[in-house]
Structure formats: C-alpha cells, structure tokens
C-alpha cells in the first residue's frame, strides 16, 4: 500500500507531512527537512530519514524516550545531504566546512577534512553485522526458532528479500544477524539492507518510525525477547581510508 | 473509522477524586501518543499531558503536574486521567485527543463534563 | 511557548474572506495547526504543519506562515463556519491559542 488515502498519513515514515493534494486529490506525503516526496508503500531511505529527525518537532526528542534497555544514541547525528533519489552523497560536510567521506549508509569512511576534500564515489556497504544482546531468559531461545522469527521479521516489517538475510547467529545471550547485498545483486525495487538495519536500530531502540504501528513486540514461541544492548558494524565494499594516526 | 469514546460527566465534591477513561477503537491503540485536554468555562484550551501507550511514558504539562496522572490500559485500549484533591477550578470539560505521527492531535473525543461543587 | 491569537471576535458576512492571526513567543518552525470548535462539539482539526488540509477539509480554509507568524484563511465565508476556531503549537509540548470567536453579521 502506499499513502493511506482514508486520514492521508505514510504507513512507512511518521517523520513526513502528507495532505491530499497529489494528482486527482490522491494523498501526497513529503519527507520533513528535505520536502521529498516518499514511496509510502516501502521504507524511506536512512538519509531522509536523518534529514527528518534533524528538523523533527523538539517533541520527537522530547516526548519519545528510548526504551530502559536501549543503547544511548551515538551513531553520529548529522544533518545530510541527500542526493534526488534520497542517497547519501559521498561527501558530507557540516556548517564550518568540514568535509567527510561517507558510504551508503552514512557513516564516516575517511578523515575529516576541509573542502577541498574529494569523495570520486558513493562507496556501498554490502555486509551489516547486528550484534543483539538478549535480557535474561529461564533458558536460552531455540536457535532456529529464533533464525525463523528474525527472518520473518526483515521479510514482513521491514519487506527485505529474505535472500539479504545471510545469517542468524546465536549464542546465548547474543544474537548476530549477518544482511549481506552488493551492488549486483539489489535489483529496483528491492529495500536496501542499510535502511532495513536503520528500521530495525530505531525499532530496537522504542523510537518506532512506523505510522500507527507500536514498538517492536518481538517473541520467539510466545516468549518474550527483549534487547538490552545493540552494536551495529557496517563493511563497505571498499575498505575506508583512515590515517594511522586515527589508529594508535 | 477512528473513535476515541469518553465516560460520561460527573459531579464530585471538593477534595474527592475523579477519573476519566477514553476507549480508542478503529487504529493501532499503541501507535499513537494520547493526550488530556481541559477546556473550563469561559476559558482557554489547556494541554494537560501525554502518554505513549506503548512503553506507557508520560509527560504533564507543569500546571497539572501533582493534580493529574494518566494510565493505560492496553488490553482494553483506554487511557485513563485522575484527577486528585478537586477544587472548584477544575470544572471543566475534559477531552482526550489522539496525537498523530507529528503530534499534532488528529483525533478527538466528545468530552467528559467534571463538575466540582459542594 | 506562548500563543498570542487575534483577534479575539469577530463579526462578517456569508461570503467575505476572514484572516485569523497567531504568534508564538518563539520559533516553532511550521508545527502549528488549526481547530474549528462548535459549542458542545470536540475540536476538528482543519489544517497542520502550518499549511496542510487535513483531509476532507474544504478548500476554502487554508494556512501560511512559519518561525512566528501564522495565518488562517476563510476564502469566503459560509454559514456553517461558524464557530470559534483555535490555533496549536505542537513544536515543544502543546499551546493553544485562545480562540477567535467568528459570527455572522
């Protein structure tokens, strides 16, 4: 589905204004910040999305708490820029003419630098780790029970082709979910895993960005899991370019 | 159809207690933020605070802070408002408001009437 | 965040075009909507993010403004209009303007 035509809102993204005024009345959502008008009937990319959160009503940080267990926020908040398809562009810069190289889901991959710094390309990251630890349970999940629950869940909430899902480990109390897509392999249409993982961090976190829909209720057989911690490692498909000194 | 349904009106003496539900029906109950609306006679509307049903937060604006606590009950989908220690001031009409992605209250109920009076 | 609506009355005619005002004591960037309250009625929300029409709201209202300065708009002015009608902010917490009366001359 796309924008719900009965109240006018975007099932995929709160963080967007919609009003009835797209060709014949149809209901049109733009995302905030960037005034981008979404596909409300897929995910938004992770740079709009950031773009939104940076213009949000104060009350989104305000009234949203991060649930009890959830990691403190420290995945770089920036203002980005997005290119017309709602990418990220290779070089970020902030307001003192700072300039960095990003990849594709955002995150810094060189030295920070000034303007004259070159980014040749949007360097894609095809290979996401996400380290979960679990809260105590009376035992540990079923390990393929916990394989099917978690794939279902990028399959339906987040509509990743279950082919991205390499793998699920686990070994009690941490669960690692391997999402792996290069270049080749995303076909049009297909969710990028790195948006997938930025749904499911901000889900994690109980700052749901689903229209209407609660948190994450997450049960493997009935039973409860509940994430108390989350470690998101992100591979490129070219290493970064980082000095040694950033090193020692 | 979005519906949010409220108790009906009540006359309470000073110094007692009230309290309000608001049934929701028609959408995703823990989605969405619910919020407190005081209207006294003659006077401005008034914000009076906020609870997501999903993690069960609230937030009060500060004049009610003491005077107001707001519940949940999601296996019913209601969000409840005491009122503590009443006085002649808090007659009022009392609407629950649903909050929309962006806050804003997209949705409301017919009102509850609380007369306080000795 | 204080809101400052004006004017507090108003009196016009089926047809002419009516201008309400709020201020915000402070950049609220384009977090405001508008309500049109009947009496014994619950608000109706008519327009937010400043300029947007909620749905199934007639085209002859509309909205402008952002940082401080708002306006609402009656294009022309139709009997069942009448109501008082209120401004939010929704930027930090919630204000509400104190309403503008409108009636019909």
């Known amino acids: 589905h796309t924008a719900a035509q009965d109240n006018c809102t975007c099932p995929t993204n709160k963080m967007t204004v919609c009003s009835p005024d797209g060709p014949g009345g149809r209901c049109q959502c733009r995302a905030l910040g960037s005034g981008m008008a979404v596909d409300c009937s897929t995910l938004t990319s992770k740079c709009l999305l950031l773009k939104a959160r940076m213009s949000a009503p104060k009350n989104a940080r305000t009234l949203v708490r991060p649930s009890e267990h959830a990691l403190v926020d420290n995945d770089g908040l920036y203002d980005p820029d997005c290119d017309p398809e709602g990418r990220f562009k290779a070089r970020q810069c902030n307001q003192t003419s700072v300039c960095w190289c990003v990849n594709s889901v955002g995150v810094r991959r060189t030295d920070k630098g000034d303007l004259s710094l070159r980014c040749d390309e949007l360097v894609r990251t095809h290979h996401i780790l996400i380290d979960l630890r679990h809260r105590p349970t009376a035992g540990a999940f079923n390990h393929s029970d916990l394989d099917a629950e978690l794939r279902r869940l990028f399959r339906e909430r987040y509509r990743l082709h279950p082919k991205f899902v390499a793998a699920v480990h686990y070994e009690q109390p941490t669960i690692q979910i391997e999402l792996r897509q290069n270049t080749s392999q995303k076909a049009a249409g297909d969710v990028d895993i790195g948006d997938a993982a930025y749904y499911f961090e901000r889900d994690i976190k109980g700052e749901s960005l689903f229209q209407g829909r609660g948190g994450l209720d997450l049960r493997v057989r009935g039973e409860p899991l509940q994430v108390e911690r989350t470690l998101i490692y992100y591979l490129d498909e070219i290493p970064p370019k980082f000095s040694m000194k950033r090193l020692t | 159809q979005v519906q949010l349904v409220q108790s009906g009106a009540e006359v309470k003496k000073p110094g007692a207690s009230v309290k309000v539900s608001c049934k929701a029906s028609?959408?995703?109950?823990?989605?969405?933020?619910m919020n407190w609306v005081k209207q006294a006679p003659g006077q401005c509307l008034e914000w009076i605070g906020i609870i997501n049903p999903y993690q069960g937060d609230t937030t009060y604006n500060q004049k009610f802070q003491g005077k107001v606590t707001i519940t949940v009950d999601k296996s019913t989908s209601t969000v409840y408002m005491e009122l503590s220690s009443l006085r002649s001031e808090d007659t009022a009409v009392y609407y629950c408001?649903?909050?929309?992605?962006?806050?804003?209250?997209?949705?409301w109920g017919q009102g509850t009437t609380v007369t306080v009076s000795s | 965040i204080q809101m400052t609506q004006s004017p507090s009355s108003l009196s016009a005619s089926v047809g002419d075009r009516v201008t309400i005002t709020c201020q915000a004591s402070q950049d609220i960037n384009k977090y405001l909507a508008w309500y049109q309250k009947k009496p014994g009625k619950a608000p109706k929300l008519l327009i937010h993010?400043?300029?947007n029409l909620q749905t199934g709201v007639p085209s002859r209202f509309s909205g402008s403004g952002s940082g401080t300065d708002f306006t609402f708009t009656i294009s022309s002015l139709q009997p069942e209009d009448i109501a008082t009608y209120y401004c939010?902010?929704?930027?930090?917490?919630?204000?509400f303007g104190c309403g503008t009366k409108l009636e019909i001359k």
């Open positions: 408001a649903r909050g929309a992605g962006l806050y804003y209250f997209d949705y």
């Open positions: 939010l902010q929704y930027d930090d917490l919630f204000t």
């Open positions: 993010y400043t300029s």
């Open positions: 028609g959408s995703s109950f823990t989605g969405y933020t």
